[in-house]
Amino acid sequence: VEVKVPTEPLSTPLGKTAELTCTYSTSVGDSFALEWSFVQPGKPISESHPILYFTNGHLYPTGSKSKRVSLLQNPPTVGVATLKLTDVHPSDTGTYLCQVNNPPDFYTNGLGLINLTVLVPPSNPLCSQSGQTSVGGSTALRCSSSEGAPKPVYNWVRLGTFPTPSPGSMVQDEVSGQLILTNLSLTSSGTYRCVATNQMGSASCELTLSVTEPSQGRVA
């Protein structure tokens, strides 16, 4: 049996229904069987777990996703073995295997792989600060969302009116969410906002930096 699946990965927003397309061509016999299984990201295919079987004219959902899986066409004997997964969770991200068996059609292995990513908006990030907050010192402002798929990008902005910082005194890394402030001055004091963004949305946190004379330094 030759199985056809999309070549591009599938992305589905959190809570929505994922349709994992799988089609095939074979003269369906009584021994026809379909199995859908799931493997977590980074795990080998050999560690896949079955989530649905169809055999002898009956459908058998199984495992932790059993209440949320069904077939687009039941019975799946018309050439369409597409799986529907409702109310997708972040833990549904991974590789799905569609395997069709129909003896004596052994021309190919009857296996198709689909990568699913569940899209999750960034959670409210946590803003933190470390380093010397005295004049002339350096500090790092950090921002991190515990949730978000694809991984959020981070952008720091200083709120309010302030003089333009000298070149190189503010360097940010959109991937790590870190903002490095060097050669601090009293005018570096203020509120900094970090916005975490991906295609599903954005979330932010704020941090107030107080730059002090060399004898003292603190963050409010």
Partner: antibody, heavy 118, light 107 residues
Framework: EVQLVESGGGLVKPGGSLRLSCAAS????????MSWVRQAPGKGLEWVAS????????HYPDSVKGRFTISRDNAKSSLYLQMNSLRAEDTAVYYC???????????WGQGTLVTVSS | DIQMTQSPSTLSASVGDRVTITCRAS??????LAWYQQKPGKSPKLLVF???TLPEGVPSRFSGSGSGTEFTLTISSLQPDDFATYYC?????????FGQGTKVEIK
């Protein structure tokens, strides 16, 4: 030599019923998916029903679903098509065909003519 | 449903001609296409399956090609026995459908 011989065609009134038969020989019937394909006079081919090797799965196009029933008797190497609620547009030559491992039709019978007319 | 469209509907040719018939599918059917030959008053005969595979006994002057949505049946040198009607059929997902046919007649 593969042989498929249809019978049971004839003249029937609209709304009437007819049962076609197909006697198979020259191959292992119980291992083969089978179909009926029809051809209206002067027209093209239309697949109308299929059945899996042991009869567990049957399929139909929308044009005949609910009116036609395909069945088989592997002990007799026979295929059947029960046609109910016949319409004028069902008038055609009905062919019995064997399916290959993929669903193309590698052997065909000579056909039997069904005429639906008042 | 997948629609199959053949062109031309009729083709006039002479013995020895190279003849090409086209079949288009309304959506991607990969290589799941068969071709049949039918003579008047006779049942169809399988010529090609999986777009390009010839069953045993089909003369090598017949060849099939294509994938996706566009397919061709070529007769490299038309013989007197080849004047007939030719049909394409997809063998992908149910319902399996046929093209409307191409009649190859003597010029």
């Amino acid at each position: 030599e593969v042989q498929l011989v249809e019978s049971g065609g004839g003249l029937v009134k609209p709304g009437g019923s007819l049962r076609l038969s197909c006697a198979a020989s020259g191959f292992t019937f119980s291992n083969s998916g089978m179909s009926w394909v029809r051809q209206a006079p002067g027209k093209g081919l239309e697949w109308v029903a299929s059945i899996s090797d042991g009869g567990l799965y049957t399929h139909y196009p929308d044009s005949v679903k609910g009116r036609f029933t395909i069945s088989r008797d592997n002990a007799k190497s026979s295929l059947y098509l029960q046609m109910n609620s016949l319409r004028a547009e069902d008038t055609a030559v009905y062919y019995c065909a064997r399916q290959g491992v993929r669903p193309f039709f590698d052997y065909w019978g000579q056909g039997t003519l069904v005429t639906v007319s008042s | 449903d997948i629609q199959m469209t053949q062109s031309p509907s009729t083709l006039s040719a002479s013995v020895g001609d190279r003849v090409t018939i086209t079949c288009r599918a309304s959506e991607n059917i990969y290589s799941y296409l068969a071709w049949y030959q039918q003579k008047p008053g006779k049942s169809p005969k399988l010529l090609v399956f999986n777009a390009e595979t010839l069953p045993e006994g089909v003369p090598s002057r017949f060849s099939g090609s294509g994938s996706g949505t566009e397919f061709t049946l070529t007769i490299s040198s038309l013989q007197p026995d080849d004047f007939a009607t030719y049909y394409c059929q997809h063998h992908y997902v149910i319902p399996w459908t046929f093209g409307q046919g191409t009649k190859v007649e003597i010029k």
